[in-house]
Structure formats: C-alpha cells, structure tokens
C-alpha cells in the first residue's frame, strides 16, 4: 500500500479579520494509526493551533467529524481571524507511539494572509493657536491594517494638499501596519470655517475611503482690527466714543477702556456678530463728561484676545479749545489714533 | 479589582428551574480568550464541572447534564447566567462561577472563582 | 471522560515537613493540560499550579508540582499552617473537564 500523503490542497488563503479562515487537510490514507495535529510556523517554536487528541481550542472547529473510523478529512475551520492569526498553517499526521506519539508527516502548509481594514483615521492639529500667515502641521494617524499597501490624501476644503510626509510602521513583516502622516497647513484670515480631511484608502475598504476631519476652527486665532471713533453729541458736555472690535475669532475677547492711562472700565464680549467668515465684530462704547478734564484727555481702548497681549487703539479729545456754548460735536477734535502693544 | 459575584434563589423546589447569575467586574466578558464556567460541589463533596462559554459564544457542557443547561451571556450587564432544569435532590450544591482564560496551543484553566452560593433543592 | 483519582483521601502531617499529593489520570495526558487548585476551609477553590508544574501568582514557592502521563504529583515543600485546605487537580485535556475527588491535608 502506498505510503500516506499529508495533502494540503490551498498553498495561500485570504481571510478578511472578522471572518472564519477554512484551512484544508486530507490525508491519502488511514495508515498508520494517529492523530492530526494543526501547527502555525515550524521548527521547535511552532505554535500548536488544533489537536485532534488533546486539548481545548475554542477557536477551531473541524470540517468533519474527526471521531469516525474511515475520516481522511482533517480540515479545520478557525473563527474571528485578526492579523495575529497570519502565518504558514501546517497539517502533521502523527503515528501513534508509546509514550508520546511520533511525528510522522506534515503537509507543504499553507500561508494564512488577513486582511484587516484600517481604523478610522485621528487627525490632530498643534497644541497651540495660530494666527494668518503661520504654517501649522496637522497629524493623521490609522492603525491595524493588513496588507501593508495604502494611499493617504490630504485636503484642505476639498483642495488636494501636497506638503506632507508619511510613514507606514513598521518597515518589515508584520501582522498589521499604522500609518502616520503630518500635513502642513498655511492659515488665511477666512480660515474659520475650514477643514482639514486626511483621506485612506486601502484594499480593504473597497474603494470607500475612510476619512478624519479636524476643524480649522480649533487651530486659528484671528486677532482683531480696532478702530475708535468720536459720536456726536448725545449731551451738554458729553462726547460718546466707540471702539469697534473687528473680524475676530475665537470670540474670548476683553475690552478695558483708558482714560489718561486710568482704567475707566473693562467688559467682556458677549454679544457679538458674527461674519459670513465666521469671525466676529464687537462694540464698545463710553460716555466721555467733557466739563470734568481741564486738560486734553487720552482715549484708549485696550484688547486682550485669547490670551494674547493687549493691542490697543488711542483717541485724543481736546477740551481746551472748546467754550461752553458750543455744540458738544465741536467739542472734541480727533487727533488721529496711535496703535500699540501694551505689555 | 476582578471579581465575581453569584446570585440567585438559594432554595428550589425539585423538578423546578435553578437559575443564577455571575455578576463580574474588573474584566469584560467579551474580552478575547476569555470564557465563564460554572463548576459545582455537592456539600462536602468534590468539584464538578457543569459547563463553560467562550468569548465567541462558544459552549462547551458536561454530557452528563447537557441536555438539562444552559448557560448564557449578558455583555452589556457582564453578567452571565446559568439555567438548570427538572432539578432534583442530587443538584443541591454550592455552584461557583468562575473565569476561564485560554492561554492558546490547547491550554486553558479556571484563573478566578466566585464565592459560590449554596441553592438547596427541597420542597 | 478522564478519571482523576487523587491519593491520599487525607494526609495529616506536622508543620515544617513535606507533604506529597498524587493524580493519576485513566488516559495519558499531556502535562500542559494537568492543573491543581487549592481550597480553604468555607472558600472557593482558587488556582494553584498551572500545565503540571507553573505557580501561579501570589503562590508561594514551597508549593512545586511535576508528572507527566498518567502520573502527577503536587509537592508543598515546609508545610505552614495556613496550607490546611483540599487539593483538587483538574484536567483540560479533554472535554468533560474533570476534577479529582481531591485530598485533604490537615495540620497535626
């Protein structure tokens, strides 16, 4: 009788993480006595995957049923496949010895690959806030995915971005692969309401590509354009001024008004505009009781936006020029402004 | 901190349904490669195993009391529930809930166990 | 299904010396499938050994276990009072899962 053959028809199987991976086995005949064994890998440091004798294996169960006397059939089925589970897979009939059963023949194995898709990508912008003009780097990260192949686009409001760089780890073989990729982004004054996509595409997603989004929203700060100005008289010897805070965002903004270097008031924005940009416009406004200043009085009003250090926007008054029986609007003349940055 | 907690009705009146559950926390019950068994001990007797399910909803029972179990998962409780029908005399025991780890190449043995809780069968 | 017959019913020995508990098992059994639990007077049994001969945690080093085929043995080197309990071992060699009828060491 000829000598048994250890057939393991399929050389490489595709599985699709989640899904149940069938690996085939038969043998060419029932001689000698003993059982199968399934193992991943070879040599000593072989992983045991199904014994047909001994053991619990709550992933794997057999084609057929392995208890029947004339069974050649040592398919095995294994379910919830991860990238871990990839590998060469080989079937080894074993002889029946004493005390321990012998090693008798392995099938040619076969190559278990899985595809796995890769998690929806996390993009993240910088810790800190940044103003038009600057270059921020946005990150996007995806993990777990197998084979190693993938493409990565990055769009800033649907506009293709080319200034980035990407790395899929690691470099070798490996279960499943994360990539990695940093965009750099340059900010406009219109930038509020715009996003940044990172887009991939891998064979798994069936040409549906996963997407992450960040919000420009979270990265810019736009500060705001100030401007102070003198209203007509809204009583004898009063002069209302106004300070108009201008195309601002993010909306945390506090406003202190100066007379002469002396705070008169502070508040914060609270009711604002806001513009089809997405920043905001703001008012203030004080109520300035000429008769009070001998002197020339220095209108100041001073910004703090975000946290960042105070701009400020000055109005000069003169009261000297000014007699009583004129009209409150020719009471004050503006002198011109002068911006600064108060530290 | 892992642990497993039984509860249930600890008196049953024969040929009536035992029901318990294994209230567990510090782990999930869907965590890969991990099961919940039900082993039992008569009063001072040994230990009999009455059956386990894995992760993947697989369950393996003692023929012996196979066609009378059922043993099932709550994840969203991480509860799991043991049912044991037409009981007699015989099935009085304290029945402890335990954890099962599969540690892969075939093995795989009872890593935590209940206090276990005594259910008398008497009418 | 497996038979675990586990030897002595009792073993009653003084503190300080070796206890010696035996399994022996119908079928041959691989060693990686021979577990032993331990059980405390009014406690659940509680994992002691592992795949014939590896502790496990929190398990004193006095406590070694060693066999293979049929024949298992756990060992508890310097007996200390606190070792009073029954010693069962387990199979998972094949399904039933079976436990011995155990043994039950007692402190002179």
């Known amino acids: 009788e000829e000598e048994l053959q250890v057939i393991q028809p399929d050389k490489s199987v595709l599985v699709a993480a989640g899904e149940t991976a069938t690996l085939r086995c038969t043998a060419t005949s029932l001689i000698p006595v003993g059982p199968i064994q399934w193992f991943r890998g070879a040599g000593p440091g072989r992983e045991l995957i199904y014994n047909q004798k001994e053991g619990h294996f709550p992933r794997v169960t057999t084609v057929s049923d392995l208890t029947k006397r004339n069974n050649m059939d040592f398919s095995i089925r294994i379910g919830n496949i991860t990238p871990a589970d990839a590998g060469t897979y080989y079937c080894v009939k074993f002889r029946k010895g004493s005390p321990d059963d012998v090693e008798f023949k392995s099938g040619a194995g076969t190559e278990l690959s899985v595809r796995a898709k890769p998690s929806a990508p996390v993009v993240s912008g910088p810790a800190a806030r940044a103003t038009p003009q600057h270059t921020v780097s946005f990150t996007c990260e995806s993990h777990g995915f197998s084979p190693r192949d993938i493409t990565l686009k990055w769009f800033k409001n649907g506009n293709e971005l080319s200034d980035f760089q990407t790395n899929v780890d690691p470099v070798g073989e490996s279960v499943s692969y994360s990539i990695h990729s940093t965009a750099k982004v340059v900010l406009t004054r219109e930038d509020v309401h715009s996003q940044v996509i990172c887009e991939v595409a891998h064979v798994t997603l069936q040409g549906d590509p996963l997407r992450g989004t960040a919000n420009l929203s979270e990265t810019i700060r736009v500060p705001p354009t100030l401007e102070v100005t003198q209203q007509p008289v809204r009583a004898e010897n009063q002069v209302n001024v106004t300070c108009q805070v201008r195309k601002f965002y993010p909306q945390r903004l506090q406003l202190t008004w100066l007379e002469n270097g002396n705070v008169s008031r502070t508040e914060t924005a609270s009711t604002v505009t806001e513009n089809k940009d997405g920043t905001y416009n703001w008012m203030s406004w004080l109520l300035v009781n000429v008769s009070a200043h001998r002197d020339d009085v220095k209108l100041t009003c001073q910004v703090e936006h975000d946290g960042q250090p105070a701009v400020s926007k000055s109005h000069d008054l003169k009261v000297s020029a000014h007699p009583k029986e004129q009209g409150s609007n020719t009471a004050a003349e503006n002198t011109g402004s002068n911006e600064r940055n108060i530290y | 901190q892992l642990q497993l907690q039984e509860s249930g009705p600890g008196l049953v009146k024969p040929s009536e349904t035992l029901s318990l559950t294994c209230t567990v926390s510090g782990f999930s019950l869907n965590t890969y490669d991990i099961g919940m068994g039900w082993i039992r001990q008569p009063p001072g007797k040994g230990l009999e195993w009455i059956g386990h399910i894995w992760w993947n909803d697989r369950e393996y029972y003692n023929s012996a009391l196979q066609s009378r179990v059922t043993i099932s998962v709550d994840t969203s409780k991480n509860q799991f529930s043991l049912k044991l029908s037409s009981v007699t005399a015989a099935d009085t025991a304290v029945y402890y809930c335990?954890?099962?780890?599969?540690f892969g190449s075939g093995q795989a043995w009872f890593t935590y166990w209940g206090q276990g809780t005594l259910v008398t069968v008497s009418s | 299904e497996i038979v675990l017959t586990q030897s002595p019913g009792t073993l009653s020995l003084s503190p300080g010396e070796r206890a010696t508990l035996s399994c022996s098992s119908s079928s041959t059994i691989s060693s990686t499938y021979l577990h032993w639990y331990q059980q405390k007077p009014g406690q659940a049994p509680r994992l002691l050994i592992s795949g014939t001969s590896n502790l496990a945690s929190g398990i004193p080093d006095r406590f070694s276990g060693s066999g293979s085929g049929t024949d298992y043995t756990l060992t508890i080197s310097r007996l200390e009072p606190e070792d009073v309990a029954v010693y069962y071992c387990q199979q998972g060699s094949r399904i039933p899962f079976t436990f011995g009828q155990g043994t039950k060491l007692e402190i002179k």
């Open positions: 335990a954890r099962i780890d599969y």
